[in-house]
């Protein structure tokens, strides 16, 4: 099943997306779409990009903000709305018959809420689940150490806070590690 | 408006041959998947083959693979569908379809049969 | 081949009734599904995409739902033009598949 990420409404949202050019500079077109990845192209188009640069977009609040002509394809969202929710096709069109690479994110936009999580347990949360979004700019928890994340609050909710706590105890206690 | 209109349909003999073309109106064809679906008398619809924006891939159904071949002209905002070794059960409406996934324009159809 | 299964067959419904047309698949389709509406001697028509979405020009009293495996088509307040054949096609999985249809008649 799909990876989830969140994001706050009125934050920005970043749904991670790379290939790797071959050879380099070597870029292919990628499309990302709202809606599961369909069997040809993207469905509900939001982003498009050709071989040079991004030529097609639906809304000034998408970007991609990453090196695109690295190979960072990865989606931005600017200004999420609990409308954005919902599952995004990013495809990768590798020239040749069925070659695309296909990757369906999931991203669960929440609402602002009062409850802040102590700083370790912040850090923890972020570097142990890929479904917990960092806001703006810094990209994806899951592609820092938890000593480099940044000093960001992320606000979450009692019941998302409760049931991420939950799940990385029982996480921890599989794998045998201490709870502190 | 959007417009497609096929030609080409008619009556042919087990294992001869057919073209089929479309001509497209009222949209960017060159920007545009297109598609071949089909329609047997009295029967539900099959999609048959489909070919992207450039022509540069071309996708079929398994009981059409190696005898028929789809292929555009962007310039004259045409789509074909060249029908070889035809078999009785090729008998259909075939219709021309804009979009890769689902179809919102479709033209009015024409008529395959395959028989001796 | 992804085999998708419309229900029922024939559905008999008075004018001003509501019509459920069901169509169900054996895997995830997410929401990749569209349905179609066909008349006798006619090309068939694109009603909803995106299990959901309704196409340009249809009528708001044609309504999708549902995401999966199982997907609804409801048509709330049947008038006489929309006596027709129904079909369901997914575009979830190669090669592209149509659901055998249901046909909708006047009771």
């Known amino acids: 099943s799909e990876v989830e990420y969140i994001a706050e409404v009125g934050q920005n949202a970043y749904l991670p997306c790379s290939y790797t050019p071959a050879p380099p500079g070597n870029l292919v077109p990628v499309c990302w779409g709202k809606g599961a990845c369909p069997v040809f192209d993207c469905s509900n188009v939001v982003l498009r990009t050709d071989n040079r640069d991004v030529n097609d977009r639906t809304s000034g609040r998408y970007w991609l903000k990453g090196d695109f002509h690295k190979g960072d394809v990865s989606l931005t969202i600017e200004n999420v709305t609990l409308a954005d929710s919902g599952v995004y096709c990013c495809r990768i069109q590798i020239p040749g018959i069925m070659n695309d690479e296909k990757h369906n994110v999931k991203l669960v936009v929440i609402k602002p809420a009062k409850v802040t999580p102590a700083p370790t347990l912040q850090r923890d949360l972020t570097s142990a689940f890929p479904r917990m979004l960092t806001t703006g700019e810094h990209g994806p928890a899951e592609t820092q150490t938890p000593g480099s994340l940044p000093d960001v609050n992320l606000t979450v909710s009692n019941f998302f806070c409760e049931l991420q706590i939950f799940t990385l105890t029982n996480e921890l206690r599989d794998s045998g590690a201490t709870i502190r | 408006e959007v417009q497609l209109v096929e030609s080409g349909g008619g009556l042919v003999q087990p294992g001869g041959s057919l073209r089929l073309s479309c001509a497209a109106s009222g949209f960017t064809f060159s920007n545009s998947w297109m598609t071949w679906v089909r329609q047997a008398p009295g029967k539900g619809l099959e999609w048959v083959a489909n070919?992207?924006?450039?022509?540069?891939?071309?996708y079929y159904v398994d009981s059409v693979k190696g005898r028929f071949t789809i292929s555009r002209d962007n310039a004259k905002n045409s789509l074909y569908l060249q029908m070889n070794s035809l078999r009785a059960e090729d008998t259909a409406v075939y219709y021309c379809?804009?979009?890769?996934?689902?179809?919102?324009?479709w033209g009015q159809g024409t008529l395959v049969t395959v028989s001796s | 081949e992804i085999v998708m299964t419309q229900s029922p067959a024939t559905l008999s419904v008075s004018p001003g009734e509501r019509a459920t047309l069901s169509c169900r698949a054996r895997q995830n389709f997410y929401s990749n599904l569209a349905w179609y509406q066909q008349k006798p001697g006619q090309a068939p028509r694109l009603l909803i995409y995106g299990a959901s979405t309704r196409a340009t020009g249809i009528p708001a009293r044609f309504s999708g739902s549902g995401s999966g495996t199982e997907f609804t088509l409801t048509i709330s307040s049947l008038q006489s033009e929309d006596f027709a054949v129904y079909y369901c096609?997914?575009?979830?999985?190669?090669?592209?598949?149509f659901g055998g249809g249901t046909k909708v008649e006047i009771k």
């Open positions: 070919i992207k924006q450039a022509g540069t891939e071309k």
């Open positions: 379809n804009s979009g890769s996934n689902y179809f919102d324009y």
């Open positions: 096609q997914q575009y979830n999985n190669w090669p592209l598949t």
